[in-house]
């Protein structure tokens, strides 16, 4: 328990005075927060929170979902915490199966344990398949398992959190990793035709094709030296993972002489931008 020099506000005191507590499913959780300036208890698991304004937190029949961090806070904003594991052989993992990873970043598989005394807390591939050889992870019983430096190749990887218990493996529910690619090159842009010669009243239609690793690429048709918003229509396709194509079609239904000029198809992503132009000449 914390000790502070006299005169300074001190953090609350929690009974039982330990950082971690293990209780069995069905048993009572009884936590006492002692502080003259007690404000609240906060319970947190899988980043969700609940509050209790009573200084004694009592859960008569503990369930696996009562596993988590219990924090007592006083009026000075000082706090103290205890982590409670509710050991339930039927529910070894608490899970949130939403799993997204940004390429080259770490991502957390949220499967905290309800029993810290199991062994070999790790990730396993679904249906007995091995994990990618370069997949590295760091287990944390209170948070889950952190996958380090997500690769594009891990997209739609099927995973289980796993522990060993009484000689066998116990698997969590399935997680499907969805990888958002990092932009490592500018978009590829092309235009259906580099120049057009039309008579007044004819329809002008030009298509720009934008290719990139994801639909997050931004694209627009612009008229050079003009801020006017051009009307464009889109079609898009995913040709498998990380191979996205968009066609942006610009149409002027009845071209006029003053529509003549240079039109630019511009695309950008977080790596950089690219553009391609087409020239329209309208004669009367």
């Amino acid at each position: 328990q914390p000790s502070v020099s006299p005169g300074e506000p001190s953090p609350p005191s929690i009974h039982p005075g330990k950082s971690d507590l293990i209780v069995r499913v069905g048993d009572e959780i009884r936590l006492l927060c002692t502080d003259p300036g007690f404000v609240k208890w906060t319970f947190e698991i899988l980043d969700e929170t609940n509050e209790n304004k009573q200084n004694e937190w009592i859960t008569e029949k503990a369930e696996a979902t009562n596993t988590g961090k219990y924090t007592c806070t006083n009026k000075h904003g000082l706090s103290n915490s205890i982590y409670v594991f509710v050991r339930d052989p039927a529910k070894l993992f608490l899970v949130d199966r939403s799993l997204y990873g940004k390429e080259d970043n770490d991502t957390l598989v949220r499967c905290p344990l309800t029993d810290p005394e199991v062994t070999n807390y790790s990730l396993k591939g679904c249906q007995g398949k091995p994990l990618p050889k370069d997949l590295r992870f760091i287990p944390d019983p209170k948070a889950g398992i952190m996958i380090k430096s997500v690769k594009r190749a891990y997209h739609r990887l099927c995973l289980h959190c796993s522990v060993d218990q009484e000689g066998g493996s116990v698997l969590s529910e399935k997680f499907i990793l969805k990888v958002r690619p990092a932009f490592k090159a500018v978009p590829v842009v092309s235009v259906s035709k580099a120049s057009y010669l039309l008579r007044e009243g004819e329809e002008f239609t030009v298509t720009c094709t934008i290719k990139d690793v994801s639909s997050s690429v931004y694209s627009t048709w612009k008229r050079e030296n003009s801020q006017t918003k051009l009307q464009e229509k889109y079609n898009s396709w995913h040709h498998g993972d990380f191979n996205y194509e968009r066609q942006a079609t610009l149409t002027i239904s009845s071209a006029r002489v003053n529509d003549s000029g240079v039109f630019m198809c511009y695309a950008n992503n977080t790596f950089g931008s690219a553009n391609v132009t087409t020239t329209l000449e309208v004669v009367d």
């Epitope: 947190e44 980043d47 609940n50 899970v95 939403s98 940004k102 099927c158 399935k174 499907i176 639909s215």
Partner: antibody
Framework: QVQLQQPGAELVKPGASVKMSCKAS????????MHWVKQTPGQGLEWIGV????????SYNQKFKGKATLTADKSSSTAYMQINSLTSEDSAVYYC??????????WGQGTLVTVSA | NIVLTQSPASLAVSLGLRATISCRAS??????????MHWYQQKPGQPPKLLIY???NLESGVPARFSGSGSRTDFTLTIDPVEADDAATYYC?????????FGGGTKLEIK
């Protein structure tokens, strides 16, 4: 305990822009993705896009790219959506929804945006 | 984009009987046996409320009268028996692939 608070209504003029808020409580704001959904009588429910937890990356439905911009303020646990160049077609109810365990488990009450001169 | 087609568009069912709503996806929403299909209920002036997630899992607090089934492209929401409070519009939604999409909705009326 989880709550998503949205303003009830916004009245805006054509051509203007509107920035609506979604204030989150009851969970760690930076740990969950926030989605935005548009609802009109004609088009039903349409997914606008998502702002991902942690780093604030966004992904948009192509239909709303350039029309909607999603941002978040971690310090106030608030997600925002700005819609620009408003027309009558943007009149709708806009919801924020928190993604939890693969689904939209929590929704705001919605903001009714009316575009009128 | 994955298109979700709900049928019927509207449905009138007598109190105590069974209501069945179908949702067909233009392509599979399954990955490794997980169907990324969810069902929501919406009443006028309220946001959608989650009923069923991952095709067949009952959301906490939702009555067991609601059930979901199906895989790949064909999904069903069943309410059995129907109660007066179930009058609402029901939507299916997929989040297997961007952009996430919703069905057009089925309006349930209780006779």
């Amino acid at each position: 305990q989880v709550q998503l608070q949205q303003p009830g209504a916004e009245l805006v003029k054509p051509g203007a822009s509107v920035k609506m808020s979604c204030k989150a409580s009851g969970y760690t704001f930076t740990s969950y993705n926030m989605h935005w959904v548009k609802q009109t009588p004609g088009q039903g429910l349409e997914w606008i896009g998502v702002i991902y937890s942690g780093n604030g990356d966004t992904s948009y439905n192509q239909k709303f790219k350039g029309k909607a911009t999603l941002t978040a303020d971690k310090s106030s646990s608030t997600a925002y959506m700005q819609i620009n160049s408003l027309t009558s077609e943007d009149s709708a109810v806009y919801y924020c929804a928190r993604e939890r365990d693969t689904r939209f488990g929590n929704w705001g009450q919605g903001t009714l945006v009316t575009v009128s001169a | 984009n994955i298109v979700l087609t709900q049928s019927p568009a509207s449905l009138a069912v007598s109190l105590g009987l069974r209501a069945t709503i179908s949702c067909r996806a233009s392509e599979s929403v399954d990955i490794y046996g997980n169907s990324f299909m969810h069902w929501y209920q919406q009443k006028p002036g309220q946001p959608p409320k989650l009923l069923i997630y991952l095709a067949s899992n009952l959301e906490s607090g939702v009555p067991a009268r609601f059930s979901g089934s199906g895989s790949r492209t064909d999904f069903t929401l069943t309410i059995d028996p129907v109660e007066a409070d179930d009058a609402a519009t029901y939507y299916c939604q997929q989040n297997n692939e961007d952009p996430y999409t919703f069905g057009g909705g089925t309006k349930l009326e209780i006779k």
